[in-house]
Interface confidence: low
Amino acid sequence: DSSKWVFEHPETLYAWEGACVWIPCTYRALDGDLESFILFHNPEYNKNTSKFDGTRLYESTKDGKVPSEQKRVQFLGDKNKNCTLSIHPVHLNDSGQLGLRMESKTEKWMERIHLNVSERPFPPHIQLPPEIQESQEVTLTCLLNFSCYGYPIQLQWLLEGVPMRQAAVTSTSLTIKSVFTRSELKFSPQWSHHGKIVTCQLQDADGKFLSNDTVQLNVKHTPKLEIKVTPSDAIVREGDSVTMTCEVSSSNPEYTTVSWLKDGTSLKKQNTFTLNLREVTKDQSGKYCCQVSNDVGPGRSEEVFLQVQYAPEPSTVQILHSPAVEGSQVEFLCMSLANPLPTNYTWYHNGKEMQGRTEEKVHIPKILPWHAGTYSCVAENILGTGQRGPGAELDVQYPPKKVTTVIQNPMPIREGDTVTLSCNYNSSNPSVTRYEWKPHGAWEEPSLGVLKIQNVGWDNTTIACAACNSWCSWASPVALNVQYAPRDVRVRKIKPLSEIHSGNSVSLQCDFSSSHPKEVQFFWEKNGRLLGKESQLNFDSISPEDAGSYSCWVNNSIGQTASKAWTLEVLYAPRRLRVSMSPGDQVMEGKSATLTCESDANPPVSHYTWFDWNNQSLPYHSQKLRLEPVKVQHSGAYWCQGTNSVGKGRSPLSTLTVYYSPETIGRR
């Protein structure tokens, strides 16, 4: 309804004399801000005055100040949302109706809240689940419809007057929806808690008793039983009689059926509280208990272990573990049904008594191959000696032993040969099923344990094999000692360190990386001609004629290897310069004459200079000097100079003769 103010707060608040009350409250005014607030006690509307009469517990002034005498009541609200109140202390005569008279600029509202103040602290209320069963966790709740910031309280749980050791979780609510203090206790009741009194005690901050609530626990449980046996030690011999009696010490609800169990299985036609066993046999040994049921379920007594004593039965041997690995530990267990338990054991290995072994278990800390075989035992107790059973077989497994790698070829082995190796061993359990070889290669294994290396490499140094069953045993590596011709033969210039100039002292070295056998011979060759048989080839003063393609050869008893051809380059200044003329050294004027500077040089001439008969340099720098049209004045002696990075060379003079043409002669 849009014509109403909207309030939210608990409908009724509860407290007791001397405590306090905290009233959580929110509101929304119809319009504008709150301008006036009066807290009435039991307000009544006076139609004559059109005002409310009643005790004014609190009155706000328009400026929001609180009159100094209104200390007991606090308005903790604000002008537009909060109308929370506190009364501290609260008195018995505060009980009744509180009226919150709210006025805004244009609207008024009276909101009513009930306050219930008792003379003494009222008791909390214990809430229990509808049914409690033994060992099922339940939550006990203690609820008190009270909480106030100015008056701390605590809730304590007691069982038969003794504080409960389980930790309780206390929570408080001071909201517009609810005001309460709650304590929750998680608890797994046992059957023995049935009928016990649980108390929730309200205490002040100092632990002083204020009030309490009590409930009696109704714990549903299966019947609780006690079993008695004659004879009391439940130890008998075959043919004796045994009586067992079942007593119910507690049941909620009442029990309905009785039965007896042996080793967890129900005994047929045994539905009374007494079980009579006459002339027992050893098969009747076992754990007996009685079972009584009610609506909750079956309850069982403690077990009585009936021991019917008899001499040991034929024994069997259990081996932990077979097959056993050499070096591991093995335990033998002699198993023989007997009561009382056997006190003495006799052990046999392959039919022969094992001296000093009288225990149920035989432990061998480090198994060796000779421990393999059949193990059997005989058990003995106070009633007699059992028979020896069939025994158990111990299989001792071990890796292949004394593995060797054997070269089948005649020695020495040469590069390119086919090498056959075999992998031999002395003994193995289980049998060898495969072989491994190191290093790995694309090699052939024509049969198990045989390796064939086709075209053996010069660098195949050592080979090792392993014989494998469940484990691999490696042999020591064997050296193949492959012999091969010298490798990586090359020509290397030792001196000079830089480029070779004509006249230099030059040394060439014939290098190789390896050779087996080590003894080698050297050969130097140029253009198919033998030059020397040392590892070095020396030139005291190199000439351009020494340039060319050199090879060296290195040989040993296996073969010889040649280097790649190595080019010897000799650098020299231009030499053998001459000027050639085309079409000839006599040319008719008006024609074309070409002078060419020819030379021998390494590196080739990079720069030419031309000179005339007066040793005047001409402004031409190419190898050819072209005169077109040639004039009579061009007649004379010419020479050229060639330059490269090594030096210069000059040609001798060559004379060009230019003669007059017929036309010129005719004009003259």
């Epitope: 009391s232 030690d233 130890i235 338990l341 006190t343 003495n344 106070i382």
Partner: antibody, heavy 124, light 106 residues
């Protein structure tokens, strides 16, 4: 009538040895486990050692382990306790006790007959 | 090893009932035996197993057990019952005795 008679006690210096004997009669000796129990002057009973009917199982109290050795001779109906490296705290009256069962490891049923004890005094 | 704990001394009026207790972890697994020892004499077995009396032991002596506690009850104590009483049980390696309870009959 069951009888257990201990002997071999006396005064001995610390570190020395002593051998106690117990002669049994009036019951089938080799059917039962036997024990030695001691009682220091003015103090309570303390179990020392036990042995099964056939010597197959033997046990010792921690306080004597490694120093004392129990044994029996069924042919002679006799129980023995060899005590080495004796200490002042071994001073006590040593009782020979018959077990109700045959194995010293059996479910305990108690010791139904006791000798009168033999006094061992360890002192320098 | 286990320990058995007994009250050092207990007294009872002539003809009244007295209970001597013995506590220890081993009693969760094994029954206690109870011995009576008078000054200068060897111990005498009075109760063994759950509640068994050797012949010659009066029926005023009885035994009981719950959890880790064993009890010896004398119903109608007599002057001749004044003695030291020892409980005894098996533990993991052998026997263990309680420290003994001196019973005085007033």
């Amino acid at each position: 009538e069951v009888q257990l008679v201990e002997s071999g006690g006396g005064l001995v210096q610390p570190g020395r040895s002593l051998r106690l004997s117990c002669a049994a009669s009036g019951f089938t000796f080799d059917d039962y486990a036997m024990h030695w129990v001691r009682q220091a002057p003015g103090k309570g009973l303390e179990w020392v050692s036990g042995i099964s009917w056939n010597s197959g199982s033997i046990g010792y109290a921690d306080s004597v382990k490694g120093r004392f050795t129990i044994s029996r001779d069924n042919a002679k109906n006799s129980l023995y306790l060899q005590m080495n490296s004796l200490r002042a705290e071994d001073t006590a009256l040593y009782y020979c006790a018959k077990d109700k069962g045959g194995g010293y490891y059996d479910f305990w049923s108690g010791s139904d007959y006791w000798g009168q004890g033999t006094l061992v005094t360890v002192s320098s | 090893s286990s320990e058995l704990t007994q009250d050092p001394a207990v007294s009872v009026a002539l003809g009244q009932t007295v209970r001597i207790t013995c506590q220890g972890d081993s009693l969760r697994s094994y029954y206690a035996s109870w011995y009576q020892q008078k000054p200068g004499q060897a111990p005498v077995l009075v109760i063994y197993g759950k509640n068994n009396r050797p012949s010659g032991i009066p029926d005023r002596f009885s035994g009981s057990s719950s959890g880790n506690t064993a009890s010896l009850t004398i119903t109608g104590a007599q002057a001749e019952d004044e003695a030291d009483y020892y409980c005894n049980s098996r533990d993991s390696s052998g026997w263990v005795f309680g420290g003994g309870t001196k019973l005085t009959v007033l």
